[in-house]
Structure formats: structure tokens, C-alpha cells
């Protein structure tokens, strides 16, 4: 178990032309929060899908007002860190998903307007424990600047938070078969819990509330001894006809080591023989290190003088991966702004650029806003190879000539029906909710009985209980 | 996912005062709107009061009056300060939240409240 922290250092407009219009107004004050979203491994799913490592929502920022006429400053940010905490391992590569959203303190019925401003994601690889790490990413004329750790919680300790550590009983050293537990040198490592009631002379465990037998006993605890007089054969007899007890399978059936390795049983267990590279109990961890030249296509290898510390690759333009072994297509970042079109020619990257658009990236915009309205007290931006209007609140359309519709957002919950009214938006309830904007069900289970979902229930408004 | 744990109930005579606490975590409240419930012995459970994220309130009409629902951001909590209380109040209370961003409606475990003499 153990935390996931990250810290927001800022965010603003980032580098280069076209600098965002600022998210607030006088007129409409604004204040910013961030949320983020944690997958296991290097997976590329859609954003849609569940924060299976967790997910968090920061405080909000400070109140922001824009001055008139100035630029987009980097914006005030809410207090402190965003923690994710997680029950289980550490995976070590992790996918995240960072989204900084705009709460608009204007006189919305029934509560404040949110909208998304920035969506960033990545894919990482992070020991716990290790220090802070240092990011940068763009979303858009939109720039993040962050970090972020993984921390075990104690007792967990290692780069997974698999280890667990308890404080020395004794000053001097462990008890017999428990190591010390670096950093931290006055605890030791904790002997594993094994189930409840388990025999302690004749089972053991290798993992947290399991109950192994030793040889010659059986049953869940590991308290009824294996008859074998009478038995078929020494490893299975029947006890549906001989009344003999079956003792579970042999350590090595189904083969627990990894990687290759091969399994030998001992008198209290097994033993795992494992091939050049692995190692641990069941050959589970690699222990390659840079002498084995673990990088592809000229990567610089890092670190990783003895097995224990990992090696990093430093990837050559063109190839990334943790071995540098996957050919970038370097198309598929975007580097080519205002929908050019990339080509990927090998030794280099040409963009091909839209009308109204050049320079080697089509960064530069020829269109310009002379002579061109946008109502309603909208502005003219330019981009695109044409003029667009930005569009005061409440108007919408290419040259904000239409009112915009309060309800877009589905601001009535559970099937309450929104109304567009001159100061916002009214929520008609369905039956049996009530709250300014449909939030509480009056009878929210149709029985005496929990946990019953409440009548009516759609998939866009689940229920959780705890 | 956001966390729930109720606190306050016990023991009160008819027409005596009682606070129940709700704090919240893994969320700020102020991103949700809350409510307390509660539910007697064989009926349904049902609202009592309710909290938006605006700060307007909402109560069932056998306690307007006599219960107020109030929110406190920095604490991360919500209150339901019950007076003038009286023998059909007895039941459990249920915290409750509904988080916009997600649409998720979340519930705590319950405290119970005894108004008898």
C-alpha cells in the first residue's frame, strides 16, 4: 500500500504564438481545480475508461479574475497535493491522465458551471520511493508543469511497496532468517502473516494468509497428519476408498518459476534455478544490468551497476521504449500545428501545410481579423485559415450571433428536465427527486431493505454504497 | 471514490437537541451536493434534508423548523443540527452524497438516533 502524490507547479499559456485567451473575465470569475486518473501499466485505453489504480480531485484554486487587456499569466492554483492512494503493489509503469477543469462563479442555478479546460496523458515507468519526478506537458496553446512520486506507507517498503518492515525488538540485529530493511536501518524486515490458526510447526507461507503444509501434513490449517499406509502411492492416495488424506499438490506442479527458470523441491518447499538475467524466489525480478547491454538501436545505458538498481535507457532520436526497442513514429506527436499534414521522410519530418497557413511546423498564421465582427462582445481570433470568434458567455455560433444553450451540459440530475431561462436554467424534477438541481432522491430505495438502487436508476447516475 | 462517516447519534429525550456530523473523503464537499437521510424500523428510508452545491437547502416538511442542514468546507463536512426532536425522529440517519464531475451517488454506514424518555 502506499500514496501517489502529485504536485501542480503551473499552469498556462505555453510557448509560441497563439497564446489562449484567458479562461476568466471580469465579468465571469473563475477559479481552477485538477483532476487526476491512474492506470496500471503502459496501457493505451481510452480515457473513458476506469481509474483502475485510483483517481483524485484537488481543492480549488484561488478566485481568478482576468485584467483587461493583459495577456494569459500562469493561473493561481489550489493548495498542496493530489494524493491517490492504492491498496496493493506499485505497479512500476503507469498511464495517468491529468485534467485541469474551470468552475465558473457566475449566478448558475443550482450550483457553479464546470468545464474541462486541458486534458494531458502519459505513460510512465516510477519506483516508490524514489524522489520527485519532473514533467512538462502541452494540451493544446494550454502548458502543465508538475511532478509526482510514489511513497509506500508504512509498513510497506521497496520499490512496489511489496516489502514490509516492522521496528527491531532486539537493537542489535533481526531475527533468525529477517534481513534489515535499507533505508531504513533500525527495522527489519517483517516475517510474512500466514492464515489464521495455521500449524506453526508443520506449515509456513510465502505470502500474506496463506497456509502451507510441510510434507506429512494436510488439511486448511495444516494440522491433520497424511496417513500413507494404506495409500495407493506416496504422493496421491485416494480417500474416497482408503481413508487416506490427499495432500495438496507438489511445490513444483504447474511450475511457479518465471522466466524460465527451472523448480526443484526442497524439504520445506522449492527452489527455482533461474537463467542469466533473472532472479528472486520464483525469478520474478530482472537482474539485467547495463553489462548485459540491455538498449537497442544505440540507446546510452544508466545506472544499473549491481542487480538491485535499475538501468534506464537513453533512447536516440527516433526510438523510445524502456529498451529503445520501438521505432517513434514521429508523426503520431502532432508536430505540425493548424492540421498540417505530417510526412515522416526518415531523415527528416516535413510538414504540409493548409491554407492560410506556412513555416516549416505551419506554425505561422497568414489570416487576420481585419474587418471581421464577432457580436455579441465576442473577439476575433485568428486561426484555422479563417477568422473565429470567441464568444462572450451565453452566445455561441461562428460569429456568436446565436444564444447558447444553458442545458447542453446536463445540468438536471437524474432525469430531471432543464429549462433555458433569462438567468440560467430551472430544473423540473422527475417524480420522487427533489433539489434545486435534481440531486436528491426523496425514497431512494423502494424497500426497507439496503443496498436496493432507487427506482429509475440509468447508468449515468450509478450508486455507491459504502 | 468518495467516503462517507456519520457521527452524533445516541440517546435524547423528546424535544432535546442532537448534531449529527458527516465528513467526507477522497472529495471536497464542496464539489458535492449532500444530504441526510434516514430510515425507521419496517418503512422506507427517506430525506430529510438536502445541501446543493450552491448552498441552497432543501427539507421534508415534518422538519422544517426544527432541523438545519449547513456545510463547512474547510472541515470537509456537513452538519444536521436537529432540535425540538421527537419520538417518531427515532432512526437511523444516512449521509449522502451526489458528486457532479462523476454522476455517483455515495452512501455512509449510518448513525443511529434514539429520541425516547
Known amino acids: 500500500a502506499g500514496v501517489f502524490e502529485l504536485q501542480i507547479h503551473s499552469f498556462g499559456p505555453g510557448p509560441g504564438p497563439g497564446a489562449p485567451r484567458s479562461p476568466c473575465s471580469a465579468r465571469l470569475p473563475c477559479r481552477l481545480f485538477f483532476r487526476v486518473c491512474l492506470k496500471p501499466g503502459l496501457s493505451e485505453e481510452a480515457a473513458e475508461s476506469p481509474c483502475a489504480l485510483g483517481a483524485a480531485l484537488s481543492a480549488r484554486g484561488p478566485v481568478y479574475t482576468e485584467q483587461p487587456g493583459a495577456p494569459a499569466p500562469d493561473l493561481p492554483l489550489p493548495d498542496g497535493l493530489l494524493q491517490v492512494p492504492f491498496r496493493d503493489a506499485w505497479p512500476g509503469t503507469f498511464s495517468f491522465i491529468i485534467e485541469t477543469w474551470r468552475e465558473e462563479l457566475g449566478d448558475q442555478i443550482g450550483g457553479p458551471a464546470w468545464s474541462l479546460l486541458a486534458r494531458v496523458a502519459g505513460r510512465r515507468r516510477l519506483a516508490a520511493g524514489g524522489p520527485w519526478a519532473r514533467d512538462i506537458q502541452r494540451a493544446g496553446a494550454w502548458e502543465l508543469r508538475f511532478s509526482y512520486r510514489a511513497r509506500c506507507e508504512p509498513p510497506a517498503v521497496g520499490t512496489a511497496c511489496t516489502r514490509l518492515c516492522r521496528p527491531r525488538s532486539a537493537p542489535s540485529r533481526c531475527g533468525p532468517g529477517l534481513r534489515p530493511c535499507a533505508p531504513l536501518e533500525d527495522e527489519c524486515e517483517a516475517p510474512l502473516v500466514c492464515r489464521a490458526g495455521c500449524s506453526p510447526e508443520h506449515g509456513f507461507c510465502e505470502q500474506p494468509g496463506e497456509c502451507r503444509c510441510l510434507e506429512g501434513w494436510t488439511g486448511p490449517l495444516c494440522t491433520v497428519p497424511v496417513s500413507t499406509s494404506s495409500c495407493l502411492s506416496p504422493r496421491g492416495p485416494s480417500s474416497a476408498t482408503t481413508g487416506c488424506l490427499v495432500p495438496g499438490p507438489g511445490p513444483c506442479d504447474g511450475n511457479p518459476c518465471a522466466n524460465g527458470g527451472s523448480c526443484s523441491e526442497t524439504p520445506r518447499s522449492f527452489e527455482c534455478t533461474c537463467p542469466r538475467g533473472f532472479y528472486g524466489l520464483r525469478c520474478e525480478v530482472s537482474g539485467v544490468t547495463c553489462a548485459d547491454g540491455p538498449c537497442f538501436n544505440g540507446g546510452l545505458c544508466v545506472g544499473g551497476a549491481d542487480p538491485d538498481s535499475a538501468y534506464i535507457c537513453h533512447c536516440p532520436p527516433g526510438f523510445q521504449g524502456s529498451n529503445c526497442e520501438k521505432r517513434v513514429d514521429r508523426c503520431s506527436l502532432q508536430p505540425c500545428r493548424n492540421g498540417g499534414l505530417c510526412l515522416d521522410l526518415g531523415h527528416a519530418l516535413r510538414c504540409r501545410c493548409r491554407a492560410g497557413f506556412a513555416g516549416p511546423r505551419c506554425e505561422h498564421d497568414l489570416d487576420d481579423c481585419a474587418g471581421r465582427a464577432c457580436a455579441n462582445g465576442g473577439t476575433c481570433v485568428e486561426g484555422g485559415g479563417a477568422h473565429r470568434c470567441s464568444c462572450a458567455l451565453g452566445f455561441g455560433g461562428r460569429d456568436c450571433r446565436e444564444r447558447a444553450d444553458p442545458c447542453a451540459a446536463r445540468p438536471c440530475a437524474h432525469g430531471g428536465r432543464c429549462y433555458a431561462h433569462f438567468s440560467g436554467l430551472v430544473c423540473a424534477c422527475a417524480p420522487g427527486y427533489m433539489g434545486a438541481r435534481c440531486e436528491f432522491p426523496v425514497h431512494p430505495d423502494g424497500a426497507s431493505a439496503l443496498p436496493a438502487a432507487p427506482p429509475g436508476l440509468r447508468p449515468g447516475d450509478p450508486q455507491r454504497y459504502l | 471514490e468518495v467516503q462517507l462517516v456519520e457521527s452524533g447519534g445516541g440517546l435524547v429525550q423528546p424535544g432535546g437537541s442532537l448534531t449529527l456530523s458527516c465528513a467526507a473523503s477522497r472529495s471536497s464537499v464542496s464539489f458535492l451536493s449532500m444530504a441526510w437521510y434516514r430510515q425507521a424500523p419496517g418503512k422506507k428510508r427517506e430525506l430529510v434534508a438536502g445541501?446543493?452545491?450552491?448552498?441552497?437547502?432543501d427539507y421534508i416538511d415534518s422538519v422544517k423548523g426544527r432541523f438545519t442542514i449547513s456545510r463547512d468546507n474547510a472541515k470537509n463536512s456537513v452538519y444536521l443540527q436537529m432540535n425540538s426532536l421527537r419520538a417518531e425522529d427515532t432512526a437511523v440517519y444516512y449521509c449522502?452524497?451526489?458528486?457532479?464531475?462523476?454522476?455517483?451517488?455515495?452512501w455512509g454506514q449510518g448513525t443511529l438516533v434514539t429520541v425516547s424518555s
Open positions: 445541501i446543493s452545491t450552491d448552498g441552497s437547502t
Open positions: 449522502y452524497a451526489y458528486r457532479w464531475l462523476t454522476r455517483y451517488t455515495y
